[in-house]
Interface confidence: low
């Protein structure tokens, strides 16, 4: 990622998207190393700290304000040249978030998808945003940007993600920007986890004492596999949330998690998936569906002693 012969490469760590009040490190990489460099901002709202300043290796900028949003370039020190400085680097856009209220982010057809499928992430708001930005957690490259479309008092943009591969799984957030301030972004949307399934062999799902139980009888669903999954995820058809448990190695060399559902009040179709700690958003193929039937006096809900995970917590590690 080096620049051209006489062109430094300017980058930002951890990301070009910086929350208001946060910090960002700007690094100017020039001629096989970090040298003295100067930074400048390509607009009229000059951040005063740059005037006549020379930096070494990297410059930590912050706490950032909306005035820090914009395009930056650097020049590397080149003592024997006519000007003493290299050609300007690549432009680097720093976006500052937290300047407007957050938009909403939805996944169509849903956040749980098979490898190879495409998902549309729709970012929308009643704020008349001119542009929307989509950013994946942990990625330092610039977010994707789309022009907002306005309809019935709502501005929105549809981002197409796919065909889905493990590298695209993760936690997404979107932001909006208003006219005339393209790099002063809104607060982030609530995080949305995009999970890709179908990458590893399916686990097996069984019910104790069995798939048909009396109303009020305690039921446990066991998910197991020969694969050394770290986490199992249990989903019930028609429920937005999944439950997850750490896998436990068993004497028979399988890896298993037991989901206690409590006293049976209502049946349903269940599936489970396995995943590894290193890639929490990449799941196995689904187990065969398991239909749990309740005889006697079914009611409309099933208590869950294991708290369902939030829709945005799937891609975090289980501690």
């Amino acid at each position: 990622l080096m620049g051209g012969q006489d062109k430094p490469f300017l980058s930002a760590r951890p990301s070009t998207v910086v929350p208001r009040g946060g910090h960002v490190a700007l690094q100017c990489h020039y001629r096989r190393g970090f040298n003295n460099f100067m930074l400048y901002k390509e607009d009229r709202s000059h951040v005063p700290i740059f005037h006549g300043r020379i930096f070494q290796e990297s410059f930590i900028m912050g706490p950032v304000t909306p005035a820090h949003a914009g395009t930056y370039r650097c020049r590397g020190s080149r003592p024997h040249s006519l000007t003493g400085w290299s050609a300007p680097s690549n432009p680097l856009v720093i976006m500052v978030t937290g300047n407007h209220r957050k938009p909403s982010l939805l996944a169509h057809p849903g956040p749980l998808l098979k490898s190879g499928e495409t998902v549309i992430l729709q970012c929308w708001s009643d704020v008349m945003f001119e542009h929307f930005f989509l950013h994946r957690e942990g990625i330092s490259e610039d977010p994707s940007r789309l022009v907002g479309q306005i309809h019935d008092g709502v501005s929105k943009a549809n981002f197409s993600i796919g065909p889905l591969m493990p590298v695209l799984a993760g936690t997404y957030r979107c932001y909006g920007s208003v006219p005339h301030s393209p790099y002063q972004l809104s607060a982030p949307s609530d995080p949305l986890d995009i999970v890709i399934t179908g990458l590893y062999e399916k686990p097996s799902l069984s019910a104790q004492p069995g798939p048909t139980v009396q109303a009020g009888e305690n039921v446990t669903l066991s998910c197991s596999s020969w694969s050394s999954y770290d986490i199992y995820h249990l989903s019930r058809e028609g429920e937005a949330h999944e439950r997850r448990l750490r896998a436990v190695p068993k004497v028979n060399r399988t890896f298993q998690a037991d989901f206690p559902l409590g006293p049976a009040t209502h049946g349903g179709t269940y599936r489970c998936f396995g995943s590894f700690r290193a890639l929490p958003c990449v799941w196995s193929n689904s187990s065969d569906p398991l239909l749990v039937s309740v005889t006697g006096n079914p009611s409309s809900s099933w208590p869950s002693p294991t708290e369902p995970s939030s829709k945005s917590g799937i891609c975090r590690h289980l501690h």
Epitope: H131, R145, V147, Q149, H151, N158
Partner: antibody, heavy 120, light 107 residues
């Protein structure tokens, strides 16, 4: 069906102004941005700018910033582009185009074009 | 501003030929790209959007590919009505520049 119908050809003298219209039908005018594109004789396409009819917000290509003024009349679903201080190099076909919706939207509908000739 | 460089600028081919036109952006445009066909005296007509998606009513012999900075329009088997000028256009922030065009002529 969606239609964008533009005003007829114009012949103007250098220094004059001209106002080109683009009447939209078949969709909700305020729900889509309207863009203008220029094509000089024998040349390629150049994006001039756009107007958001619901807010009146406009954005111009810097090249045309002092040349064009874009407006919209929501009561008649008509977008306008006025070209001022005309010169011979402004001779071109001017198109209006609607920016679509959905996945990475393109210009999905175009007007038939309005020829503006600047000649003394 | 983002520059769009189309190649070739002109191309002679015969009915039935497979033809490829390329478009290179001066920076990553993340598939925010459309292709248009224009015939003399007519407005441009949308062929593909989002780099690879066929617009309504466009024959399947047209296809698009690419990502990042490099994109391609392919016509798998040229028909007489395909002889026209083709333009790419990016939507990665304003100004939405077009390629300079590729004129496809009958050999």
């Amino acid at each position: 069906q969606v239609q964008l119908v533009q005003s007829g050809a114009e012949v103007k003298k250098p220094g004059a102004s001209v106002k080109v219209s683009c009447k939209a039908s078949g969709y909700t005018f305020t729900s889509y941005t309207m863009h203008w594109v220029r094509q000089a004789p024998g040349q390629g396409l150049e994006w001039i700018g756009y107007i958001n009819p619901s807010s009146g917000y406009t954005e111009n290509n810097r090249k045309f910033k002092d040349k064009t003024t874009m407006t919209a009349d929501t009561s008649t679903s008509t977008a306008y582009m006025e070209l001022s201080s005309l010169r011979s190099e402004d001779t071109a076909v001017y198109y209006c185009a609607r920016l679509g919706k959905g996945l990475l939207p393109p210009f999905d509908y175009w007007g038939q074009g309005t020829t503006v000739t600047v000649s003394s | 501003d983002i520059q769009m460089t189309q190649s070739p600028s002109s191309l002679s081919a015969s009915v039935g030929d497979r033809v490829t036109i390329t478009c290179r952006a001066s920076e990553n445009i993340y598939s925010n790209l459309a292709w248009y066909q224009q015939k003399p005296g007519k407005a441009p007509k949308l062929l593909l959007y989002a780099a690879t998606n066929l617009a309504d009513g466009v024959p399947s012999r047209f296809s698009g590919s690419g990502s990042g900075t490099d994109y391609t329009l392919t016509i798998s088997s040229l028909q007489p009505e395909d002889f026209a000028t083709y333009y790419c256009q990016h939507f990665w922030g304003t100004p939405y520049t077009f390629g300079q065009g590729t004129k496809l002529e009958i050999k």
